[in-house]
Amino acid sequence: VPDKTVRWCAVSEHEATKCQSFRDHMKSVIPSDGPSVACVKKASYLDCIRAIAANEADAVTLDAGLVYDAYLAPNNLKPVVAEFYGSKEDPQTFYYAVAVVKKDSGFQMNQLRGKKSCHTGLGRSAGWNIPIGLLYCDLPEPRKPLEKAVANFFSGSCAPCADGTDFPQLCQLCPGCGCSTLNQYFGYSGAFKCLKDGAGDVAFVKHSTIFENLANKADRDQYELLCLDNTRKPVDEYKDCHLAQVPSHTVVARSMGGKEDLIWELLNQAQEHFGKDKSKEFQLFSSPHGKDLLFKDSAHGFLKVPPRMDAKMYLGYEYVTAIRNLREGTCPEAPTDECKPVKWCALSHHERLKCDEWSVNSVGKIECVSAETTEDCIAKIMNGEADAMSLDGGFVYIAGKCGLVPVLAENYNKSDNCEDTPEAGYFAIAVVKKSASDLTWDNLKGKKSCHTAVGRTAGWNIPMGLLYNKINHCRFDEFFSEGCAPGSKKDSSLCKLCMGSGLNLCEPNNKEGYYGYTGAFRCLVEKGDVAFVKHQTVPQNTGGKNPDPWAKNLNEKDYELLCLDGTRKPVEEYANCHLARAPNHAVVTRKDKEACVHKILRQQQHLFGSNVTDCSGNFCLFRSETKDLLFRDDTVCLAKLHDRNTYEKYLGEEYVKAVGNLRKCSTSSLLEACTFRRP
């Protein structure tokens, strides 16, 4: 019989008492085969973290800073359940740390040196740890003691709770630096008042502070937020302009064998019976013998943290950077305006080899990082382990939802001004063998399908989106008799046609021979009835253009396109017979890397782009013999995006809407995780 006990860790007598009450009340409402609670008492949160890691306890609820400690080795804990605040309809699990300034003050984030600062309190998250952590490497040396470095960075501050004797500049704007509401500039509202009164130039607070203190929109319009990319935004655009997104209070568990499903089952049942306004005799979010015992008193309920989300992703790049800077106190030798090497994310073995060759030739400008799937690469870019990669539009959508931005677009047509003219896109098509003359768009049911990969534009999002509109369900593996759609569940019929060996079968990378445009076409040639690819795929792999044994004798005339009106046309008539127009592949990165990725890639394409005539002996960035490694092989150049610099603007309203409709069919664990952070 599996043990269905969750050992909850308590950090005080009062918490232990509430835990026992929690245990007893759960017993009275949950059947004997359901989850139960046991209580483990420890002296501190850090002791609880160690106990969970050592399998002496299973769960504890932590503030963000402690979630970071819990994630560090050797603890390796992960977030499993989040408390939410506000309403069930609009649950808030995060708050945003922001830098508020007056509208007419005219300086940016990188010009804070010498300004006057207002903080909620020394050592507090939004008011101190996050802003000072992010500014850490700009502080004058020596950076220890930290208070002294901060005092020398700003021209005056109010940092309640600081030592006014040792660091008088930190109390310059609020004499005495009182650590309670007796100090008018203490806490969130106090720090904002410090700015409002004109004592300070910038206030480090929560996104809600300004709304709580200024009910009138006209008054709020006198203030702006400083963004990390050295721009400003209105105060209501805090989701796109903040220092960090911080989880409020989170239940953590072991990463391996952590009982996360059991913990969720327990807490979900607990909130049903003892949540807000549910029961008089025991209330989960109430602490008669103290404050915030086990859970925050202000919490309204729990949400399950998506399983793909580790602590780094949950806390977010900015928060982790800030806390790591404060804890480790390490900075690059001397901050320079020069760009650090761009860490390119390579998918599996073959891309890694090409990336290594690029790295050797780039002379220190490109480094390589490997991952097994596109989603793993996106996650690595999010958390700073990697910086950039080029993505199909379907993954540009996921990357965008995860906070990344497009920076350059692949262009596929030769033109005089290639780098300045991003193209409208390419065509997604359905290809069949000419010999299968009875096959049309209207009778694909039961046929064998070949896809570039799940989540990609031409191979999945466009054809499956159109199919979904017709069949109104997501069981595509039942619609086709079998197929190869790399990235599908291994036991799905949509992995049956794939050719990868062993663990590589149906993997969404080049270890699966039927992956990508060329792979999907090969799948059609060898096994399938229809392939969903781009309009250039057939000509690029026929007429001897692909020297591989399976392709060298193929003839373009032996293939036709399926049109949406039920007719068929020759391959060259793609402009009048396609499924939809697809946005070109694009390079994505984090916002903080945007300028450097743009600069370095433009240099790199001038050295190794289409201007290189002999690729047999020289490195060519856009060549890999139809394998589309790192970039599509038909890329002519990487083009500036001009104002199409967000994923929505880049992909266009129509495509974003189409992918949004397919979301209900999405199996993307990363998309689920990212929409948890930003619904």
Epitope: H350, L353, E357, V360, N361, G617, F619, S624
Partner: nanobody, 117 residues
């Protein structure tokens, strides 16, 4: 396709040195990038050092300051001088010319380097 043959491996004590050679069956003068990789048991193959035709080099962080890559186009050979060897340098070392534009698995036999006391 140029064939590459690696040699020079062996058993050496920590702190010792070895010089690996990679002899090509044809001219390497027109080949831009040559590189040494290594693969330890149960690990992924990783880039150790690379050199371009112009003599620009790149090294893995773990070997910087200890290993030196060089090429002699006249002798159609690429070398890897390995000093101050450590137990974690134990692996099979392979040479590549990246000449297959689609980066398939065309590796030679490699040469075994074992660093142990």
């Amino acid at each position: 396709q140029v064939q590459l043959v690696e040699s020079g491996g062996g058993l050496v004590q920590p702190g010792g040195s070895l010089r690996l050679s990679c002899a090509a069956s044809g001219s390497i003068a027109s080949i831009n990038t040559m590189a040494w990789y290594r693969q330890a048991p149960g690990k992924q193959r990783e880039l150790v050092a690379g050199i371009t035709s112009g003599g620009s080099t790149k090294y893995a962080d773990s070997v910087k300051g200890r290993f030196t890559i060089s090429r002699d186009n006249a002798k159609n050979t690429v070398y890897l001088q390995m000093n101050n060897l450590k137990p974690e340098d134990t692996a099979i070392y392979y040479c590549t010319d990246y000449s297959k534009r689609y980066y398939q698995d065309y590796w030679g036999q490699g040469t075994q380097v074992t660093v142990s006391s």
